[in-house]
């Protein structure tokens, strides 16, 4: 029951997190015009990953897309890439985790397969969250650097006669959404990995006994025992045609993913 709850909660938390990452990526307010200690302008500038916008006191908002790809700063491209990778991994993770949920029965899927899928989705959520946090942090670092650079030469002009006030940008709402969303996705991923350990069946405390038939040796696993052996493993009481007697542990040649947790 606790495993199901942990898995379900991990899924929900990750779902909220990925929705937040998508929202943050699409938001226009990654950086907003710094209004503190600045002359009050009748326009408010803010920028996203895909376009920059200007909101006037009049009520009009004008947004212009970044139609160039090569002309954009490498850092912005990197942030875009990190956010997109985060979304893609998160989306795949969600898809995998839906099938991995203990409360959903799909055919005769084994607990072992569900455990593997839970772990896979958990890892994907963790990487997705890290991508989002990294992307937002890179952008934030870029803003801080530019902020202090523009503060250093806040007023530029010809001999101090004509002054041009440089627009300084500070953290926008999207950064906070991204950080929180990335964190939630990360937490959700960790919860999925924890749930995976609970889903994995315990190793048996006894060895499978080998019975010698007159014709050839056939080792049988005890009936009703569903071993989790991962991808390409022997399950469902399959016969192992082999010369001598072996223990169950020796037969298990392909370790399952959750063995490494």
């Amino acid at each position: 029951m606790a495993v199901t709850a942990c898995q379900g909660l991990g899924f929900v938390v990750s779902l909220i997190g990925i929705a937040g990452i998508i929202a943050a990526t699409c938001m226009d307010q990654w950086s907003t015009q710094d209004l503190y200690n600045n002359p009050v302008t009748a326009v408010f500038n803010y920028q996203g990953l895909w376009r920059s916008c200007v909101r006037e006191s009049s009520g009009f908002t004008e947004c212009r897309g970044y139609f160039t790809l090569l002309g954009l700063p490498a850092m912005l491209q990197a942030v875009r890439a990190l956010m997109i990778v985060g979304i893609v991994l998160g989306a795949i993770g969600l898809l995998v985790s839906i099938f991995a949920l203990k409360c959903i029965r799909i055919g005769s899927m084994e607990d072992s397969a569900k455990a593997n899928m839970t772990l896979t989705s958990g890892i994907m959520f963790i990487v997705s969250g890290l991508c989002a946090i990294a992307g937002v942090s890179v952008f934030a670092n870029m803003l801080v650097t530019n902020f202090w650079m523009s503060t250093a030469n806040m007023y530029t002009g010809m001999g101090g006669m004509v002054q041009t006030v440089q627009t300084r940008y500070t953290f926008g709402a999207a950064l906070f959404v991204g950080w929180v969303a990335g964190g939630l996705t990360l937490i959700g991923g960790v919860m999925m990995c924890i749930a995976c350990r609970g889903l994995a069946p315990e190793e048996t405390n006894y060895k499978a006994v080998s019975y010698h038939a007159s014709g050839h040796s056939v080792a049988y696993k005890p009936g009703g025992f569903k071993a989790s052996t991962g991808f390409g493993s022997n399950t469902k009481n399959k016969k192992i045609y082999d010369g001598g007697a072996r223990t169950e542990d020796e037969v298990q040649s392909y370790p399952s993913k959750h063995d490494y947790v």
């Epitope: 015009q33 002359p39 009050v40 302008t41 009748a42 326009v43 500038n45 920028q47 920059s52 916008c53 200007v54 909101r55 006037e56 006191s57 009049s58 009520g59 009009f60 004008e62 212009r64 004509v162 002054q163 041009t164 006030v165 440089q166 627009t167």
Partner: antibody
Framework: EVQLLESGGGLVQPGGSLRLSCAAS????????MSWVRQAPDKRLEWVAT????????FYPDSVKGRFTISRDNSKNTLYLQMNSLRAEDTAIYYC???????????WSQGLSVTVSS | DIVITQSPLSLPVTPGEPASISCKSS????????????LTWYLQKPGQPPKLLFY???TRESGVPDRFTGSGSGTDFTLKISRVEAEDVGVYYC?????????FGGGTKLEIK
């Protein structure tokens, strides 16, 4: 057609108060920023106040800050200018104007005379 | 506050002749966010409220004849009339629409010679 109709002007003593109203029609009032501009006799235009759209931000020049208050009632499509502690130099024709692209003022009222005199 | 300086103060012009009004700002009115200049031009005829001619320094308001042209960027702006007509008389104002407080130029009175 955009229409801006003012009311509330007149003669007032120094230190007195007056409330100007500007009833708007012909456009979605709540979506646009609005301003008050005045013009003293034979003088240049002087911006008095702005109520920006979306965010309830109000702006004033130092000459009227603390004495004048701009407000709006979107349900009544009306802009107001509450003028307190009036001085002789506040004597002017007061216009209300609708903000447009580039924070320009594309529609103006006909103007309302306010005279501050003892 | 931003100081807007307009010149000349008075501009007598013969009908059919061109006219030019200059407007200078103490600070740049160019917004880096959209690369637009927040300078507005108005014409005020006697006994009337001002009428919008140009916004964003060079965008002509609908209904304004194309003999009027607005130009300039940053701190220096110009309003040109290619061929002055009798109906063009009045006081022309330029306005800073970028920084609060919004400030107007002193005005240029265009009159027919």
């Amino acid at each position: 057609e955009v229409q801006l109709l003012e009311s509330g002007g007149g003669l007032v003593q120094p230190g007195g108060s007056l409330r100007l109203s500007c009833a708007a029609s012909g456009f979605t009032f709540s979506k646009f920023g609005m301003s008050w501009v005045r013009q003293a006799p034979d003088k240049r235009l002087e911006w008095v106040a702005t109520f920006s759209s979306g965010g309830d931000y109000t702006f004033y020049p130092d000459s009227v800050k603390g004495r004048f208050t701009i407000s709006r009632d979107n349900s009544k499509n009306t802009l107001y200018l509450q003028m307190n502690s009036l001085r002789a130099e506040d004597t002017a024709i007061y216009y209300c104007a609708k903000l447009y692209y580039g924070n320009s003022m594309d529609s103006w009222s006909q103007g309302l005379s306010v005279t501050v005199s003892s | 506050d931003i100081v807007i300086t307009q010149s000349p103060l008075s501009l007598p012009v013969t009908p059919g002749e061109p006219a030019s009004i200059s407007c200078k700002s103490s600070q740049s009115l160019l917004n880096s966010g959209n690369q637009r200049n927040y300078l507005t031009w108005y014409l005020q005829k006697p006994g009337q409220p001002p009428k919008l001619l140009f916004y964003w320094a060079s965008t002509r308001e609908s209904g304004v004849p194309d003999r009027f042209t607005g130009s300039g960027s940053g701190t220096d702006f110009t309003l040109k009339i290619s061929r002055v007509e009798a109906e063009d008389v009045g006081v022309y104002y330029c306005q800073n629409a970028y920084y609060y407080p919004f400030t107007f130029g002193g005005g240029t009175k265009l009159e027919i010679k």
